[in-house]
């Protein structure tokens, strides 16, 4: 297994929607034709994964049916989106990327990126 | 040119297995996924799975987990789909397609399940 | 999973005449893909990414739409165009088709 350097912003703030995207950029050393990226989400230590696709030559990213994740592809960089964020879905989104194919296998960990996510003021009672 | 060929038409009994070739040329095999599609008489068009070729990686619709087998043999770029404890349901036109696109087909395997 | 369905199911039109055909998914996609099928043959791709024609495809077809709703157009339907089209989504597992709309000679 061989170490790879993985970039990704620091601070993303979800939409009202509860939507968040950001980029995940890695430093392929050769050219993979398959590529595994997982978003794992820590918060109090603990460690669980949110999402995750295998991608070959296509420009979009496809993930399980009841994934919170849709994203594309552009050359090393993977563009992720997270939907459906509430305010206890607050906390550090790490992006792992893995060269599945071909040899050697490459392994690449992002330092996270700290997604804020404010729940909406629901809207006052109008009289009108 | 890219080409994908498959085995020719199969007739097998209820309970029974077949296993479906779909070889490639024309391109690196292993820069592209490997697709089955399913087609039964009159019917339309139903994903069963795909297979990465380099690292055998594969993702199969649940509806046909348990009963369909995928896999490759890179050293001849080919690409077999094996469906087991076969039933009447099962009989249909088996295709391979290429990629995230579906952009080259086989031209199909007629795999029929008669008693 | 995602389902699409596909308006019209049948559709009766005449060489020359302008055709839309409607692709509505249950949930909301990235992109779409269309494919022309004809009776005894593989499927052909017609376009993908929702709008980008693939490689010899004639200019008369085109592609639009996004979210949950995309539209397949003949702008002038050609005898050889006679066939069932499909679109396809590859936005989450399993990819699923539509139905199909067969397009036939009025």
């Known amino acids: 297994c061989k170490a790879m350097h993985v970039a990704q912003p620091a601070v993303v703030l979800a939409s009202s929607r509860g939507i968040a995207s950001f980029v995940c950029e890695y430093a392929s050393p050769g050219k993979a034709t398959e590529v595994r990226v997982t978003v794992l989400r820590q918060a109090d230590s603990q460690v669980t994964e949110v999402c995750a696709a295998t991608y070959m030559m296509g420009n979009e990213l496809t993930f399980l049916d009841d994934s919170i994740c849709t994203g594309t592809s552009s050359g090393n960089q993977v563009n992720l989106t997270i939907q459906g964020l509430r305010a206890m879905d607050t906390g550090l989104y790490i992006c792992k990327v893995e060269l599945m194919y071909p040899p050697p296998y490459y392994l690449g960990i992002g330092n996270g990126t700290q997604i804020y996510v404010i729940d909406p003021e629901p809207c006052p009672d109008s009289d009108f | 040119q890219v080409q994908l060929v498959q085995s020719g038409a199969e007739v097998v009994k209820p309970g029974a297995s077949v296993k479906v070739s779909c070889k490639a040329s024309g391109y690196t095999f292993t820069s592209y996924w490997i697709n089955w599609i399913k087609q039964a008489p009159g019917q339309g068009l139903e994903w069963i799975g795909r297979i990465a070729p380099g690292s055998g990686t594969t993702y199969y619709n649940e509806m046909f987990t348990g009963r369909v087998t995928l896999t490759r043999d890179t050293s001849t770029s080919t690409a077999y789909i094996e469906l087991s404890s076969l039933r009447s349901e099962d009989t249909a036109v088996y295709f391979c397609a290429r990629g995230d696109y579906f952009d080259y087909w086989g031209q199909g395997t007629m795999v029929t399940v008669s008693s | 999973d995602i389902q699409l369905t596909q308006s019209p199911s049948f559709l009766s039109a005449s060489v020359g005449d302008r055709v839309t055909i409607t692709c509505s998914a249950s949930?909301?996609?990235?992109?779409i893909h269309w494919y022309q099928q004809k009776p005894g043959k593989a499927p052909k791709l017609l376009i993908y990414?929702?709008?980008t024609l693939a490689s010899g495809v004639p200019s008369r077809f085109s592609g639009s739409g996004s979210g949950t709703e995309f539209t397949l157009t003949i702008s002038s339907l050609q005898p050889e165009d006679f066939a069932t089209y499909y679109c396809q989504q590859r936005t989450t597992y399993p990819l699923t088709f539509g139905q199909g709309t067969k397009l036939e000679i009025k």
């Open positions: 990414d929702t709008s």
């Open positions: 949930k909301s996609v990235s992109y």
